[in-house]
Interface confidence: medium
């Protein structure tokens, strides 16, 4: 295994409700600079199972506004542009951390939580149940 | 914009940094009780532009393994179950926040971080560039 | 290959306090949860608590609060379950194992024990 | 506390057999459900995660089912190795809780 030493220069944690609630640095450090630019998103009109964002927001959390798709058929979209019933467009989900501002209204104070997002849609082949 | 009034049971935001840095409780609550028990968790065979799942460890980071979706192929499965190089399977990236342990090694003090990640992958129509 | 590896049987005296070690090898320790499981001879599973050394914060069922402290120093990979208050009804087999905390396939995953010692037999007898 | 009930306590069953073990929780937990399998003196083994998603190297024969109450273990084509007491657990919430075992035999 890694061995990891102790930084000799760590925060105090003698708060009483260390260490649930720890000091956390907000300057976000973004590792995406790398990252197509486009980040796919002229996929969701070019999709077989093409889907739509909606907007949901919510002032107490960080980030405030997440965008979540809905996909637009049950199927898929074959090659004539029709929608084939016979597969099916479904959303991948994902949870994310987000920061929940707690107590609520503090400009300073956060809980982490999970919450689940539908980031895009995928064309499935359907599972059949086949009735005796 | 929305106005939200203080919390007067904020606490005291007289460190230097603020707000840069804030008080996070990392007692995870989960959000997602009521969601679809499936977990997206078998579309990545089940898909038209199936994926693989590649593991990403870094042990300063929270969550320290990600598995990231690499698409199988450059086309898309079709109804014969061959790879249609008409269509193209392309990623579905999504930022997610994590936790970096910042300094190094010290287990209660962080930065939040963005990464972006590939949650699964989608069947696309390509753009055609036509060469005059 | 990720491995769990515990300390020796132990024999005790009613009242004395145990310590057990749990060292793990073959992965990033500090980001994984420690958990400790008992199972008294012919009984289930019973969970004790358990410690996410990246945080450093360990969470203990209610039943051994006050009687049980969970530790993990990173620089050696080694997790320390100590029992203490010791009576007859501790007689059990102690085990460690990992909880996982992963991003798998679009989900936060840290909720399961995927890798287990070999258990710690623990013995309190007057 | 999350209380998990398996059913049945024992289950006794001919090589090549089919097995089923539910478990069933107090309250609704998603799909945060696991199966373990212990054989004689020996540690357990995580078998299922997620209500349905096999663990590292867990042959085919063993699946899972469910969600929010109730769940299914099922073991299709039973092994002689296979004997041994199969556990379901949550991590939904704190304290984890395991359910209080099934033990399988083969005749």
């Known amino acids: 295994g890694i061995t990891i030493p102790r930084n000799p220069g760590c925060p105090n944690s003698e708060d009483k409700n260390f260490p649930r609630t720890v000091m956390v640095n907000l300057n976000i450090h973004n590792r995406n600079t790398n990252t197509n630019p486009k980040r796919s998103s002229d996929y969701y009109n070019r999709s077989t199972s093409p889907w739509n964002l909606h907007r949901n927001e919510d002032p107490e959390r960080y980030p405030s506004v997440i965008w979540e798709a809905k996909c637009r058929h049950l199927g898929c979209i074959n090659a004539d542009g029709n929608v084939d019933y016979h597969m099916n467009s479904v959303p991948i989900q994902q949870e994310i951390l987000v920061l929940r501002r707690e107590p609520p209204h503090c400009p300073n104070s956060f809980r982490l939580e999970k919450i689940l997002v539908s980031v895009g849609c995928t064309c499935v082949t359907p599972i059949v149940h086949h009735v005796a | 914009g929305i106005t939200i009034p203080r919390n007067p049971g904020c606490p005291n935001s007289e460190d230097k940094n603020f707000p840069r840095t804030v008080m996070v409780n990392l007692n995870i609550h989960n959000r997602n009780t009521n969601t679809n028990p499936k977990r997206s968790s078998d579309y990545y065979n089940r898909s038209t532009s199936p994926w693989n799942l590649h593991r990403n460890e870094d042990p300063e980071r929270y969550p320290s393994v990600i598995w990231e979706a690499k698409c199988r192929h450059l086309g898309c499965i079709n109804a014969d179950g061959n790879v249609d190089y008409h269509m193209n399977s392309v990623p579905i990236q999504q930022e997610i926040l994590v936790l970096r342990r910042e300094p190094p090694h010290c287990p209660n003090s962080f930065r939040l971080e963005k990464i972006l990640v590939s949650v699964g992958c989608t069947c696309v129509t390509p753009i055609v560039h036509h060469v005059a | 290959e990720v491995q769990l590896v515990q300390s020796g049987a132990e024999v005790k005296k009613p009242g004395s306090s145990v310590k057990i070690s749990c060292k793990a090898s073959?992965?990033?320790?500090?980001?994984?949860?420690i958990s400790w499981v008992r199972q008294a001879p012919g009984q289930g599973l019973e969970w004790m608590g358990g410690?996410?050394?990246?945080?450093?914060?360990?969470d203990y069922a209610q039943k051994f609060q006050g009687r049980v402290t969970i530790t993990a120093d990173e620089s050696t990979t080694t997790a320390y379950m100590e029992l203490s208050g010791l009576t007859s009804d501790d007689t059990a087999v102690y085990y460690c194992?990992?909880?996982?905390?992963?991003?798998?396939?679009?989900?936060?995953?840290?909720?399961?024990?995927?890798?287990w010692g070999q258990g710690t037999t623990i013995t309190v007898s007057s | 506390e999350i209380v998990l009930t398996q059913s049945p306590d024992f289950q006794s069953v001919t090589p090549k057999g089919k097995v089923t073990i539910t478990c069933r929780a107090s309250?609704?937990?998603?799909?945060?459900l696991h199966w373990y399998q212990q054989k004689p003196d020996q540690s357990p083994k995580l078998l299922i995660k997620?209500?349905?998603h096999s663990g590292s190297g867990v042959p085919s024969r063993f699946s899972g089912s469910g969600s929010g109450t109730d769940f299914t273990l099922t073991i299709n084509g039973l092994e002689a190795e296979d004997a041994g007491t199969y556990y379901c657990?949550?991590?939904?919430?704190?304290?984890?809780?395991f359910g209080q075992g099934t033990k399988v035999d083969i005749k």
């Open positions: 073959g992965g990033s320790f500090g980001s994984y949860g």
């Open positions: 657990h949550q991590g939904f919430s704190l304290p984890h809780t």
């Open positions: 194992a990992r909880e996982p905390n992963e991003f798998w396939n679009g989900y936060y995953s840290t909720d399961h024990f995927d890798y």
């Open positions: 410690i996410t050394p990246f945080f450093g914060w360990a």
């Open positions: 997620y209500a349905s």
């Open positions: 309250q609704d937990i998603g799909s945060e």
